[in-house]
């Protein structure tokens, strides 16, 4: 009778084991072991027992002890079970961002590991077990579906293998995959709201505001604002689940025409975009041209108004005839025209909006000087010793210099309060002088003496 010890062994891959082959007869003709494994016999006294060191055991094996005794030949097998933890435990790659409400399939691949009967694959969220299955196939694959929720944001998913050799007197060997950190997001189906001027004048600045509600996590949202090829640099303010991005936009003559204003919100692997057209226009103020800005009374003056070729102008409220970008009027300059404003209003239609521009010029009419009865009375009669203010106003442009003299030397204090005396009486020659010439007027002052009763 042949016996083997131990009859069952579990050992690590590549490991060694001592196997003893024994026989019940004292003088066996033959005693040995049959195995493809590298073996080394350890010398022992006696004939009925042999010990072998079997080395580099890579896979399960069943070495067989045999003996040949007088009463016949017999065999005994020992069962070598090799154990080893899996080579690779991996979660199939997934995009790190996942939309809330989507089903996420987690797939764990386990390469190798033995004995498979003792190997279990566990899918985890944090420390919570989602699925536990025996390892079957090569690679062993375990999948589970998770409905992505908001509160999964930042959760770590992993895969763990458990090689449980505790029933064999060994330990529980665990291998864990690299974690997959889930980042969940909500990007609403509604496009962002874009508030901006529909038209924008060259060499001016406009303000663009892009906003969106219902985002999660709002701090991770990227906002891209652009006008044509020009990237805008917005200032973004965040609410609980909303943001508002405000940017200043400057346009130049090169941008003239219809430009696309875009606001794109990128969150996770999704984006929402709003497009708007902005018309960039150039519209200089109309030009008011006077033949000369300063003319003498009686001169013929032409007032012209010229504007953008597509504009329509009115000059002093009178539309151009025919309606268009030019208007003019003719006038003979009178003193009343001095300081008169000529206002040109131009209207341009840009993208359905009416844009108004004005330009005003003032006409200076040179006239005078003038001294008349209304402003410079020819006769004053005042009681002696009364307080009076002689008034004489000369008119003209430029304003004339006025002097009133009696006998060529004695001045009348125009515009000053004086006490009337006999000396004041007499005829004065008032002379108004300017670059336009001079005029004179005689003014008589009568002084009434008091009556003594």
């Amino acid at each position: 009778q042949t016996s083997v010890s131990p009859s069952k062994v579990i050992l690590p891959r590549g490991g060694s084991v001592l196997v003893t082959c024994s026989t019940s007869c004292d003088q066996p003709k033959l005693l040995g072991i049959e195995t493809p494994l590298p073996k080394k016999e350890l010398l022992l006294p006696g004939n009925n027992r042999k010990v072998y060191e079997l080395s580099n055991v890579q896979e399960d094996s069943q070495p067989m002890c045999y003996s040949n005794c007088p009463d016949g030949q017999s065999t005994a097998k020992t069962f070598l079970t090799v154990y080893w933890t899996p080579e690779r435990v991996e979660l199939a790659p997934l995009p790190s961002w996942q939309p809330v409400g989507k089903n996420l399939t987690l797939r764990c691949q386990v390469e190798g590991g033995a004995p498979r009967a003792n190997l279990t694959v566990v899918l985890l969220r944090g420390e919570k077990e989602l699925k536990r299955e025996p390892a079957v196939g090569e690679p062993a694959e375990v999948t589970t579906t998770v409905l992505v929720r908001r509160d999964h944001h930042g959760a770590n998913f992993s895969c763990r293998t458990e090689l449980d050799l505790r029933p064999q007197g060994l330990e529980l060997f665990e291998n864990t995959s690299a974690p997959y950190q889930l980042q969940t997001f909500v990007l609403p189906a509604t496009p962002p709201q874009l508030v901006s001027p529909r038209v924008l004048e060259v060499d001016t600045q406009g303000t663009v505001v892009c906003s969106l509600d219902g985002l999660f996590p709002v701090s991770e949202a990227q906002v891209h604002l652009a006008l044509g090829d020009q990237r805008l640099n917005p200032t973004v303010t965040y609410g609980n689940d909303s943001f508002s991005a405000k940017a200043s936009v400057s346009v130049t003559a090169e941008d003239e025409g219809t430009q696309r204003l875009t606001c794109a919100v990128i969150l996770g692997n999704q984006s929402q975009e709003t497009l708007q057209t902005v018309t960039i226009y150039s519209f200089p103020a109309p030009n008011v041209i006077l033949t000369k800005p300063e003319v003498s009374e009686g001169t013929e003056v032409t007032v012209k108004c010229e504007a953008h070729p597509r504009a329509k102008v009115t000059l002093n409220g009178v539309p151009a005839q025919p309606l268009g970008p030019r208007a003019q009027l003719l006038l003979k300059a009178t003193p009343e025209d001095n300081g008169r404003s000529f206002s040109c209003s131009a209207t341009l239609e840009v993208a359905g909006q009416l844009i108004h521009k004005n330009q005003t010029r003032e006409l200076r009419v040179l006239y005078g000087p003038r001294l008349d009865e209304r402003d410079c009375p020819g006769n004053w009669t005042w009681p002696e010793n009364s307080q009076q203010t002689p008034m004489c106003q000369a008119w003209g442009n430029p304003l004339p210099e006025l002097k009133c003299l009696k006998d060529g030397t004695f001045p009348l204090p125009i515009g000053e309060s004086v006490t009337v005396t006999r000396d004041l009486e007499g005829t004065y020659l008032c002379r108004a002088r300017s670059t336009q010439g001079e005029v004179t007027r005689k003014v008589t002052v009568n002084v009434l003496s008091p009556r003594y009763e």
Partner: antibody, heavy 120, light 111 residues
Framework: QVQLQQSGAELVRPGVSVKISCKGS????????LHWVKQSHAKSLEWIGV????????DYNQKFRGKATMTVDKSSTTAYLELARLTSEDSAIHYC?????????????WGQGTALTVSS | DVVLTQTPLSLPVNLGDQASISCRSS???????????LHWYLQKAGQSPKLLIY???NRFSGVPDRFSGSGSGTDFTLKISRVEAEDLGVYFC?????????FGGGTKIKR
């Protein structure tokens, strides 16, 4: 004992397809994946791809995508490699080899190889 | 793809000599789990390749202990302490760290 028995040598004309087989025995067939390797004088050894004998999942070397198709029949413990639109470049010995799916412990047992000659 | 360069291409030996083959990788073969999936095969004339060493230094079942593997990162070596007649053939290194898996060009050990 572990054995991978491959189908015999093939002499085929350019432009056609050929399907070679690899039968596994002496082990639990679905416990190991099967890899296919091409050996030609010009390019030494080239890995074509791997098939899971359990699930039928495959991974190909990009170079052989569209050229090679790997399949498996669990019931007969046989894997197949089909090569399409053959040219003289496909003339080589094609081996199947047993391993873990990602080959982490090496290709421990190989078939005897199938010699493919493409000639008009 | 990862390129494995073997040197020398050919190695004449006397039986009983020590032989050494080098395999250099174009990038590190350390996988993210810390293991290095570099293996060695021997192909004798008219036969299919046979696995000798897996994961740099582990001898496969039935491989004599005169074969040893060493190295790390990008530089690896296979040593045969005393060459025997049955060791003659072409030796290939191979990597299973990066996809697609690749082989070295081979080193022929001859008498």
């Amino acid at each position: 004992q572990v054995q991978l028995q491959q189908s015999g040598a093939e002499l085929v004309r350019p432009g056609v397809s050929v399907k070679i087989s690899c039968k596994g025995s002496g082990y639990t067939f679905t416990d190991y994946a099967l890899h296919w390797v091409k050996q030609s004088h010009a390019k030494s050894l080239e890995w074509i791809g791997v098939i899971s004998t359990y699930s039928g999942n495959t991974d190909y070397n990009q170079k052989f995508r569209g050229k090679a198709t790997m399949t498996v029949d669990k019931s007969s413990t046989t894997a197949y490699l089909e090569l399409a639109r053959l040219t003289s470049e496909d003339s080589a010995i094609h081996y199947c080899a047993r391993s873990l799916y990602f080959g982490s412990s090496g290709f421990d047992y190989w078939g005897q190889g199938t010699a493919l000659t493409v000639s008009s | 793809d990862v390129v494995l360069t073997q040197t020398p291409l050919s190695l004449p030996v006397n039986l009983g000599d020590q032989a050494s083959i080098s395999c250099r990788s174009s990038q590190t073969l350390v996988y993210r789990n810390g293991n290095t999936y570099l293996h060695w095969y021997l192909q004798k004339a008219g036969q299919s390749p046979k696995l000798l060493i897996y994961k740099v230094s582990n001898r496969f079942s039935g491989v004599p202990d005169r074969f040893s593997g060493s190295g790390s990162g990008t530089d690896f070596t296979l040593k045969i302490s005393r060459v025997e007649a049955e060791d003659l053939g072409v030796y290939f290194c191979s990597q299973n760290t990066h996809f697609p898996y690749t082989f070295g060009g081979g080193t022929k050990i001859k008498r």
